[in-house]
């Protein structure tokens, strides 16, 4: 018996070949003895019923010359995995067809974080093994079942599942869409009084989108976290439902998602958590956001630097007069010089690699006030 | 591409010096921090210090404060451990490694050098 | 300094396993640590940053977690050349420390 492994939705090629390699009369049959198609001497293709119940069954005519009879079944159905028969040449040829079917849980557009769950259905009596692998390489094997927790942004694209079952395989293709925003936490370092910018991309696209969001922030001055701003989404547009008095946050009408901030200042420095809850999906996304704010005041013979947020504590704070060394480095969240000489002072925020924040301050003579570029 | 070689190891006593190199090439040198890192035979991996990217701050594990000093020379993308009252405990292999700092937020070392055999030995 | 404790010390396991190994920060280190794999006669290779972030190259069946002063390094279902020493880095603070390291040896 030979077996043939098929897809569901898609067609199947069961071969039958003659001795002769020339055409001749055949029949194709269902193991009950129900005539689907043959070739009865004439070269015409003759159906064994109704063109509506024999519609997704064909051969190909231009292999009979060849001696190749072959039964071509479309739009293959699970129902379709049976015992087929086809007669020539006083012989009987039996060929199973197996039908196979993976479906992924419910829905192929996943939030970052739950579970892909991808089935495999197949014919009774055949005992398959199964394989898929990620777009970014993993691979999963199992029974019929097979569970990737916890799925990242990587597992978005086209899984590929090999069904093996007596050494042939069939291959399937699932596109995976991971919800998600392009990066799970960002940091934003400014001075005092600069305009802040705060971007959420995310990291797929589809035709409509539609949900709702919020913003809450963490101020570190803060006891307890507030809601900065409440959003609505319509296919891609983005409306603000409710937003705090202070700060008066503005939110652009498009996506990506964008927040500004009129003014950077110490009592805004923090930690904020956007969520995003998109129609027709159960949990939200999240992207974390960090504001980091330094301020460089002079008042009478001191001159200080402050930054107030969420910094690293390997973070270095220094005070130096422009293109001399640093008067004073500290691991701290403030540092300061007393007496400062006048020029023009730098403050600055710097780690093991590069200055990340930088706030110049002019100090005058004495008998003068400072000036704040 | 981005490498890193390290150079000057060797047999030396108790109470003597040494001074190790690492050549960097690939990459812009003057932008990234850079750590020693090394490990005794049969023991785990040991940090050992970091420059910061302008040189102007060093920071040291307690075993070698005092003794060790990291520095760096961004003209000619090297990195240096000056080891001075060397003790045989710090026998090891001696690499040099890269630190990668992402908005001050996120830190890794992704390259390393094949390191350099430093024995201590009367 | 920060003590990192990692355990186990030592474990044997097979090809296809999956293993876990843990780290503990003597005090909170947010998501300051990484995991460096090391194999004899080479040099130490970066697979896990900030807590759970996989570096580029790195196969896909490392995966890294946690938050604070608990973290876990998973290898999903090991191949023949994973078999090496994982070591856990705090870099959250100056001086760095590495955990005593996990040999991971083949049953």
């Known amino acids: 018996k030979t077996l043939v492994l098929g897809k569901e939705g898609e067609s199947a090629e069961l071969p039958c070949e003659s001795s002769q390699k020339k055409i001749t009369v055949f029949t194709w049959k269902f193991s009950d003895q129900r005539k689907i198609l043959g070739q009865h001497g004439k070269g015409v293709l003759i159906r064994g019923g109704s063109p509506s119940q024999f519609d997704r069954f064909d051969s190909k005519k231009g292999a009979w010359e060849k001696g190749s009879f072959p039964l071509i079944i479309n739009k293959l159905k699970m129902e379709d995995s049976q015992t087929y028969i086809c007669e020539l040449e006083n012989r009987k040829e039996e060929v199973e067809l197996w039908v196979f079917k993976v479906t992924a849980n419910s829905d192929t557009h996943l939030l970052q974080g739950q579970s892909l769950t991808l089935t495999l259905e197949s014919p009774p009596g055949s005992s398959p093994s199964v394989q898929c692998r990620s777009p970014r390489g993993k691979n999963i094997q199992g029974g019929k079942t097979l569970s990737v927790s916890q799925l990242e942004l990587q597992d978005s694209g086209t899984w590929t599942c090999t069904v093996l079952q007596n050494q042939k395989k069939v291959e399937f293709k699932i596109d995976i869409v991971v919800l998600a925003f392009q990066k799970a936490s960002s940091i934003v370092y400014k001075k005092e009084g600069e305009q802040v910018e705060f971007s959420f991309p995310l990291a797929f696209t589809v035709e409509k989108l539609t949900g709702s969001g919020e913003l809450w922030w963490q101020a570190e001055r803060a006891s307890s976290s507030k809601s900065w701003i409440t959003f609505d989404l319509k296919n891609k547009e983005v409306s603000v439902k409710r937003v705090t008095q202070d700060p008066k946050l503005q939110m652009g009408k498009k996506l990506p998602l964008h927040l500004t901030l009129p003014q950077a200042l110490p009592q805004y420095a923090g930690s904020g958590n956007l969520t995003l809850a998109l129609e027709a999906k159960t949990g939200k996304l999240h992207q974390e956001v960090n504001l980091v704010v330094m301020r460089a005041t002079q008042l009478q013979k001191n001159l200080t630097c402050e930054v107030w947020g969420p910094t690293s504590p390997k973070l270095m704070l220094s005070l130096k007069l422009e293109n001399k060394e640093a008067k004073v480095s500290k691991r701290e969240k403030a540092v300061w010089v007393l007496n400062p000489e006048a020029g023009m002072w730098q403050c600055l925020l710097s780690d093991s690699g590069q200055v990340l924040l930088e706030s110049n301050i002019k100090v005058l003579p004495t008998w003068s006030t400072p000036v704040q570029p | 591409q981005v490498q890193l070689v390290e150079s000057g190891g060797g047999v030396v006593q108790p109470g003597r010096s040494l001074r190790l190199s690492c050549a960097a090439s690939?990459?812009?040198?003057?932008?990234?921090?850079m750590h020693w890192v090394r490990q005794a035979p049969g023991k785990g991996l040991e940090w050992v210090a970091i420059?910061?990217?302008?040189?102007?701050?060093?920071y040291y594990a307690d075993s070698v404060k005092g003794r060790f000093t990291i520095s760096r020379d961004n003209s000619k993308n090297t990195l240096y451990l000056q080891m001075n009252s060397l003790r045989a405990e710090d026998t090891a292999v001696y690499y040099c490694?890269?630190?990668?700092?992402?908005?001050?937020?996120?830190?890794?070392?992704?390259?390393w050098g094949k390191g350099t055999t430093v024995t201590v030995s009367s | 300094a920060i003590q990192m404790t990692q355990s186990p010390s030592s474990l044997s396991a097979s090809v296809g396993d999956r293993v876990t190994i843990t780290c503990r920060a003597s005090?909170?280190?947010?998501?300051?640590l990484g995991w460096y794999q090391l194999k004899p006669g080479k040099a130490p290779k970066l697979l896990i940053y900030?807590?759970?972030s996989l570096q580029s190259g790195v196969p896909s069946s490392f995966s890294g977690s946690g938050s604070g002063t608990d973290f876990t390094l998973t290898i999903s279902s090991l191949q023949p050349e994973d078999f090496a020493t994982y070591y856990c880095?705090?870099?959250?603070?100056?001086?760095?420390?590495f955990g005593q390291g996990t040999k991971l040896e083949i049953k």
């Open positions: 490694t890269r630190e990668v700092a992402l908005e001050g937020y996120y830190y890794y070392m992704d390259v």
């Open positions: 005090q909170g280190i947010r998501n300051g």
């Open positions: 880095l705090q870099d959250y603070n100056y001086p760095y420390t």
């Open positions: 690939g990459f812009t040198f003057s932008s990234y921090g």
């Open positions: 900030a807590a759970s």
């Open positions: 420059i910061w990217y302008d040189g102007n701050n060093k």
